[in-house]
């Protein structure tokens, strides 16, 4: 049930743009996924330093990506 | 409160059929990927099968594959395990959980199981 | 398949003892390690996820270290409740797969 060939070079290096928008790279199975019922764009990827991850939050809940936003939580999606 | 409440287990004959259930309550059941877990007396915690939020996609342990099927019922909110051709070996005490991710830029990232059942047994004895 | 090896696989110690248990893994699997604590008849609670990110809810006495191949948990000041099997488990591929456990028991 795999979608396709997109995936990533190495499990910590990003290739160039390796899923399409609606999409978002499941590192758990090296393939791009639907991101699912994230209200908000996908967010632009994060910089160099993110801070530690957090909790995931509640579906009902902003996921806005804020100017600082490296690390966003998803509501357990996928 | 967030919970799992698991049910379906019992004694059932090598060879047969059984299906367990998880009912899960205090959260959005369809956002999350669902997982089955299972612990033979005395042994260790083995990974069965993970289910995505919308049943796009399915995995299974090398164990269990083309015998056992994850479903889930999202108006439900029910998560299942079909298992079929059951075998002696399949004895154990059977978790399901939530799968914990983040997302960090178009990155997910898996970081385990956060919310877990009760567990129910499975006993399969002739 | 990813092999987790913990150690000691059981041990033995007092309330108030600084307790640390390791976990390693067969490839490395970047800082993709979470720590559970099961006690008898009961679920797997998730302790620390991502190495060393502390769950909601948790005491701050428990801590995790590590990336790449050698995990470490810690427990600063061993309570009476904290005597149960001490597991970890790696998210970092498909299929799931978790150490043995260890065992924390009264001296």
């Known amino acids: 049930m795999r979608r396709g060939p997109r995936s990533l070079r190495g499990r910590d290096a990003p290739a160039p743009t390796p899923c399409v928008p609606a999409e978002c790279f499941d590192l758990l199975v090296r393939h791009c996924v639907a991101c699912g019922l994230l209200r908000t764009p996908r967010p632009k990827p994060a910089g160099a330093s993110s801070p530690a991850p957090r909790t995931a939050l509640q579906p009902q809940e902003s996921v806005g990506a804020g100017a600082g936003e490296a690390a966003l939580p998803l509501p357990g999606l996928l | 409160e967030v919970q799992l409440v698991q049910s379906g287990g019992g004694v059932v004959q090598p060879g047969r059929s059984l299906r367990l259930s998880c009912a899960a309550s205090g959260f959005a059941f369809s956002s999350y990927g669902m997982h089955w877990v299972r612990q033979a007396p005395g042994k260790c915690l083995e990974w069965v099968a993970v289910i995505w939020y919308d049943e796009s996609n399915k995995y299974y342990g090398d164990s269990v594959k083309g015998r056992f099927t994850i479903s889930r019922d999202n108006s439900r909110n029910t998560l299942y395990l079909q298992m079929n051709s059951l075998r002696d070996e399949d004895t154990a005490v059977y978790y399901c959980?939530?799968?914990?991710?983040?997302?960090?830029?178009?990155?997910?990232?898996?970081?385990?199981?956060?919310?877990w059942g009760q567990g129910t047994t499975v006993t399969v004895s002739s | 398949e990813i092999v987790l090896t913990q150690s000691p696989s059981s041990l033995s110690a007092s309330v108030g003892d600084r307790v640390t248990i390791t976990c390693r893994a067969s490839?490395?699997?970047?800082?993709?390690l979470n720590w559970y604590q099961q006690k008898p008849g009961k679920a797997p609670k998730l302790l620390i996820y991502?190495?060393?990110s502390l769950q909601s809810g948790v005491p701050s006495r428990f801590s995790g270290s590590g990336s790449g191949t050698d995990f470490t948990l810690t427990i600063s000041s061993l309570q009476p409740e904290d005597f149960a099997t001490y597991y970890c488990?790696?998210?970092?591929?498909?299929?799931?797969?978790f150490g043995c456990g260890t065992k924390v028991e009264i001296k």
């Open positions: 959980a939530r799968r914990f991710t983040n997302l960090r830029g178009w990155i997910i990232e898996d970081y385990g199981l956060d919310v």
């Open positions: 991502a190495a060393s």
């Open positions: 490839q490395s699997i970047s800082s993709y």
């Open positions: 488990q790696q998210s970092y591929s498909i299929p799931l797969t």
